[in-house]
Interface confidence: low
């Protein structure tokens, strides 16, 4: 059973309704237009499939569409991260991973997007009206997350109804750099659409696209994002809260950040080995999220791509350490 | 300066409890982790378990989920560790120590809190 | 839970020396390992993190080594104030154990 907030895309004029000419005209305000609404409104899309193999076993994804860099990545249940919410799993992109009871496996799929697996026994195993929320600190845009819960009464395999869109927030408010970069094709856009007031206005046709394939569309620029249209989110107070994790579970863990970049100048590589390299405290700090900070003028030696911090093929210990647990 | 202040001495009586605390000064409290650890004479140190101050959450080693119960206090950046059903065998010096969120180890250590049971 | 074992339980040894502690691990920890000093009385204090990082403040005579299920720590020339106890502990997931202790003591 899957449970997506599918973010709802801006779609192009259909071909054909006007002219070449109309068209191309088009084509520069509504690529201005898409910029101008996605600049600094990235959106998280979080899809929740329980396993038809296990009925009390979870898999969570998340995924960013958005052009920044991705800093951090907080997976939570019962609400949001800093409102009630537990933390299940921490997910850095180059220092690697932490999860907590009663997550079983943590993983990037993607340079943008995670999957958290979840063991269902226990008095901490999820259940189906729980809701997961994904958060992803990123630069330039800031904190941005989105919840998901499936449905009390579906059933394992089928799809269900999309959940509430990303919460409307963005904890560093979206370092003003890449909007204000933009401003002026704003201003221009503005000035087109006044000229082209007798034309017909291209539709936003809300889509259900897959968050697989989020920048899948030839007409959006391929770094914006595609998402612009907002659900505001309201907290759901599920019955089913997770219980004190304590050590009883097999799984622990450590609280281990190294002081994470400010601003990452590269996309994430994928968790990468770290433990030997750990940098030493110094300088100032810069808040990102969650007590969780960045080390201004300070950058992790760079590890590309295949490296893993946890080699051993059962993983880590899921850890069920000091960051969040509640 | 870095610090954290644990309360003085304890002498309670067996089957009674005890409430320590932490006081972290120098820093922001919702930055570090504060654990637990217990220290008896000429013995290695034995971790209770943690506060975690940013939501108020706690850890528990297994074998003192029972007896034990942490809790800070954001606004006068404490910490409180509360052991009940005292034996002789809690008689130790129980220390608090502050765990950096980012990088792991405990980076700072309270002076410790002596407590001892007898009748 | 992980359990720590460290070797020697005592040394002793003279001003000037190097000396090397060992700990072992029953299962593999990574490089999650922290050595600390603890003199008589007083509080433990952390000399080195990731196995092989020195904390700040710790003079550059202590150097940690190893990973997965074996460590040490190594002081060269000793000097007066670096005798003490010696603690291993892992942070590889709760609940955290400390190793026995190693008692460094002047010839």
């Known amino acids: 059973m899957r449970t997506e907030a599918q973010v709802p895309a801006l779609q192009p004029p259909e071909p054909g309704l006007e002219g070449a000419m109309g068209h191309r005209t088009l084509v520069l305000p509504w690529v201005l237009l898409t910029l101008c609404v996605t600049a600094g409104t990235p959106e998280v899309w979080v899809q929740v499939r329980m396993e038809a193999t296990e009925l009390s076993s979870f898999t969570i994804r998340c995924g960013f569409l958005g052009s920044g860099s991705i800093s951090l990545v907080t997976v939570s249940w019962g609400g949001p991260n800093g409102a009630g919410g537990t933390t299940l799993a921490v997910l850095h992109p180059e220092r690697g991973i932490r999860q907590w009871a009663p997550a079983r496996q943590a993983r990037w799929e993607t340079q943008s997007s995670i999957s958290l697996i979840l063991e269902g026994s226990g008095a901490s195993s999820p259940c189906a009206n729980t809701t997961f929320c994904c958060k992803f600190a990123s630069f330039p845009e800031g904190s941005w997350e989105a919840c998901g819960s499936l449905p009390p009464s579906s059933d394992p395999g089928l799809s269900a109804p999309p959940t509430p869109a990303p919460i409307l927030r963005a904890d560093l408010a979206g370092i003003l750099g890449v909007s204000g970069v933009l401003l002026f094709g704003c201003v221009y856009l503005l000035h087109l659409l006044r000229r082209h007031k007798h034309r017909p206005a291209p539709r936003l046709q809300p889509s259900r696209t897959s968050p697989q394939a989020p920048r899948a569309r030839a007409w959006a620029p391929s770094q914006a994002s595609q998402a612009a249209l907002h659900v505001p989110y309201a907290t759901i107070n599920t019955s089913c809260r997770p219980a004190t994790l304590d050590t009883a579970h097999p799984h622990g863990g450590p609280s281990w950040w190294a002081s994470l970049p400010t601003h990452a100048a590269h996309r994430p590589q994928g968790p990468a080995a770290w433990a030997s390299t750990p940098i030493p405290a110094r300088g100032s700090f810069v808040s990102v999220e969650n007590g969780l900070y960045a080390q201004a003028g300070e950058r992790p030696p760079h590890t590309g791509p295949g490296l893993t911090l946890f080699p051993d093929p059962r993983g880590p210990r899921a850890m069920e350490g000091p960051l969040g647990v509640r | 300066e870095v610090q954290l202040q644990q309360s003085g001495p304890e002498l309670v009586k067996p089957g009674a409890s005890v409430k320590i605390s932490c006081k972290a000064s120098g820093y922001t409290f919702t930055d570090y982790n504060i654990h637990w650890v217990k220290q008896s004479h000429g013995k290695r140190p034995d971790w209770i378990g943690y506060n975690y101050p940013y939501n108020g959450g706690a850890g528990y080693n297994q074998n003192f989920r029972s007896r034990a119960t942490l809790t800070v206090d954001k606004f006068s950046s404490t910490a409180y560790m509360e052991l009940r059903s005292l034996t002789s065998e809690d008689s130790a010096v129980y220390y608090c120590?502050?765990?950096?969120?980012?990088?792991?180890?405990?980076?700072?250590w309270g002076q410790g809190t002596s407590v001892t049971v007898s009748s | 839970d992980i359990q720590m074992t460290q070797s020697p339980d005592s040394l002793s040894a003279s001003v000037g020396e190097t000396v090397t502690i060992t700990c072992r691990t029953s299962e593999n920890i990574y490089s999650f390992l922290v050595w600390y000093q603890q003199k008589q009385g007083k509080s433990p204090q952390l000399l080195v993190y990731?196995?092989?990082t020195l904390a700040e403040g710790v003079p550059s005579r202590f150097s940690g080594s190893g990973s997965g299920t074996q460590f040490s720590l190594k002081i060269n020339s000793l000097q007066p104030e670096d005798f003490g106890t010696y603690y291993c502990?892992?942070?590889?997931?709760?609940?955290?154990?400390f190793g026995g202790g190693t008692k460094l003591e002047i010839k």
């Open positions: 990731n196995a092989k």
């Open positions: 502990q892992h942070y590889y997931g709760t609940p955290y154990t």
């Open positions: 120590a502050g765990e950096e969120v980012r990088r792991g180890p405990f980076y700072f």
